[in-house]
């Protein structure tokens, strides 16, 4: 019987060019975590395997960093990074738990741009 629950950062937003930490936490179970997959809709981003450790997909090596913990850091964000992200916990003996995060990547704020200009 699967008793665990996954807590995630939920819906989050970040600015284009910045970075964001995706975090999930599995609680209320004593099951052993054998692997965590981080996936973006239809793409594998990275896995953290109990034996192998962290492994980042070649498609994302230049802008994904492992951690903190079992989380994942996305860097150099673009608007194309907007969308659903999934943390998939493979556990024994429970099976698979899945958490969902929605990330919205925003253009830099008007206020930030405005600060660069002096009002005459």
């Amino acid at each position: 019987m699967m008793t665990g629950t996954i807590e995630t950062t939920g819906n989050i937003s970040a600015e284009k060019g910045g970075s964001i930490i995706l975090q999930c936490h599995l609680s209320s179970t004593t099951a052993q975590v054998t692997q965590v997959n981080w996936e973006q809709q239809d793409q594998l981003l990275a896995i953290c395997n109990a034996d192998l450790g962290w492994h980042i997909s070649p498609s994302f090596k230049d802008r994904v960093a492992p951690g903190p913990g079992l989380g994942l850091t996305l860097q150099s964000l673009t608007v194309n990074d907007t969308g659903e992200y999934f943390c998939i916990y493979h556990t024994y003996p429970d099976g698979t738990y899945t958490g969902r995060i929605f990330l919205e990547v925003l253009e830099s704020s008007v206020a930030e741009h405005g600060a660069r200009f002096q009002i005459p």
């Epitope: 239809d42 594998l44 997909s57 070649p58």
Partner: nanobody
């Protein structure tokens, strides 16, 4: 679950070539990372090369320019073309794969021996 079957290992002379194959079956939908690791006697297991469904690749520095990884998505099969083999390439080569939402799966290993 995913099953991996490797083939193509054997004995080859220094400077020779071999081609390894890794065929995946079972739950093989979505994106994947497929690759080859190797382990020489008394040494740590190390990544040799890997490829994604979209064709992005990554190589260990020690094999760049000599080894080429490729894949046939329609067959869920990855290939490792090994050229200019050296005695230090002697190892058991393991195929590994992770498919979307699935666990990491290992093949049984195939021995590559480079010797004159």
């Amino acid at each position: 679950e995913v099953q991996l079957v490797e083939s193509g290992g054997g004995l080859v002379q220094p400077g020779g070539s071999l081609r390894l194959s890794c065929a995946a079956s079972g739950r093989t939908f979505g994106d994947y990372i497929m690759g080859w690791f190797r382990q020489a006697p008394g040494k740590e297991r190390e990544l040799v090369a890997e490829i994604t469904r979209s064709g992005r690749t990554n190589y260990a520095d020690s094999v760049k320019g000599r080894f080429t990884i490729s894949a046939d998505n329609s067959k869920n099969t990855a290939y490792l073309q090994m050229n200019s083999l050296k005695p230090e390439d002697t190892a058991v080569y393991y195929c590994a794969a992770v498919f979307s939402r699935g666990p990491l799966t290992w093949g049984q290993g195939t021995l590559v021996t480079v010797s004159s």
